[in-house]
Interface confidence: low
Amino acid sequence: GSTVPPMVNVTCSEVSEGNITVTCRASSFYPRNITLTWRQDGVSLSHNTQQWGDVLPDGNGTYQTWVATRIRQGEEQRFTCYMEHSGNHGTHPVPSGNSHHHHHHHH
């Protein structure tokens, strides 16, 4: 089938001791090969500081996956989610302030 770019959604969840978990979700993309990773100050975080979900079918002929990492509260602006899919790439910031969701569809 033709290439379908992912919808990328970055969310935050508060956890204890001043840390938050930031999760980057990519959904509704085809084909299934995708790079999704967290960067701090533009530098990719190491594998053992991130957690990934499998790339799974979402029931519509497209795929979904996610990557998460824990960061210190207040340092959100230093982190971005990097996505590369079928030759296209983009970076997605962690939402600031009270906004805990950020959506962006790649074209």
């Epitope: 990773t37 990719s44 979900g53």
Partner: antibody, heavy 120, light 107 residues
Framework: QVQLKESGPGLVAPSQSLSITCTVS????????VNWVRQPPGKGLEWLGM???????DYNSALKSRLSISKDNSKSQIFLKMNSLQTDDTARYYC??????????????WGAGTTVTVSS | DIQMTQTTSSLSASLGDRVTISCSAS??????LNWYQQKPDGTVKLLIY???SLHSGVPSRFSGSGSGTDYSLTISNLEPEDIATYYC?????????FGGGTKVEIK
Amino acid sequence: QVQLKESGPGLVAPSQSLSITCTVSGFSLTGSGVNWVRQPPGKGLEWLGMIWGDGNTDYNSALKSRLSISKDNSKSQIFLKMNSLQTDDTARYYCARGAYYGKRWYFDVWGAGTTVTVSS
Amino acid sequence: DIQMTQTTSSLSASLGDRVTISCSASQGISNYLNWYQQKPDGTVKLLIYYTSSLHSGVPSRFSGSGSGTDYSLTISNLEPEDIATYYCQQYSKLPPTFGGGTKVEIK
């Protein structure tokens, strides 16, 4: 074009230390991890360790006490240092880029390797 | 460490033959298995990642399969340039470990 090239001393005396440099081009060390793998003559491949984009390192526990991996992002160079070499450290030493997404992790581009002989 | 075993250290086949190379792990590795080709001059190339995904630029005559502890690499139509040693490698747990290799020669 992604390329990696190892350069080493060729010959090292027993009990001395080994330093090898891997110079890369075509990609940034801040965004990719680089692995070190060696192959003794006539034998298989052995993973030594790696350095991630953020500078974190992982080592093969069997060699951890003798190994150190570092890098200079601005010069696109990775450095392997191994102490207390013995004759069974004689091998071809490779650097290889580590690519990963999701739960897939693989060494997608390898250098040609540099041969190190430990002998007096 | 997880031990990877390639029971056949060398094999001879005719051009055009279908060649299968097997690899077994000392414990389940959840398809976290790659295959590499090493030419006689020492050049190493990635062929297959995550059990069955063909790396870009690799001919389609190469394929991978398996699950649990048992995996295989198949060359469907052996060509002269396939003369090499083939290594499986697991990355289920650090350290990544390689099989002992299978050398493929022409009859």
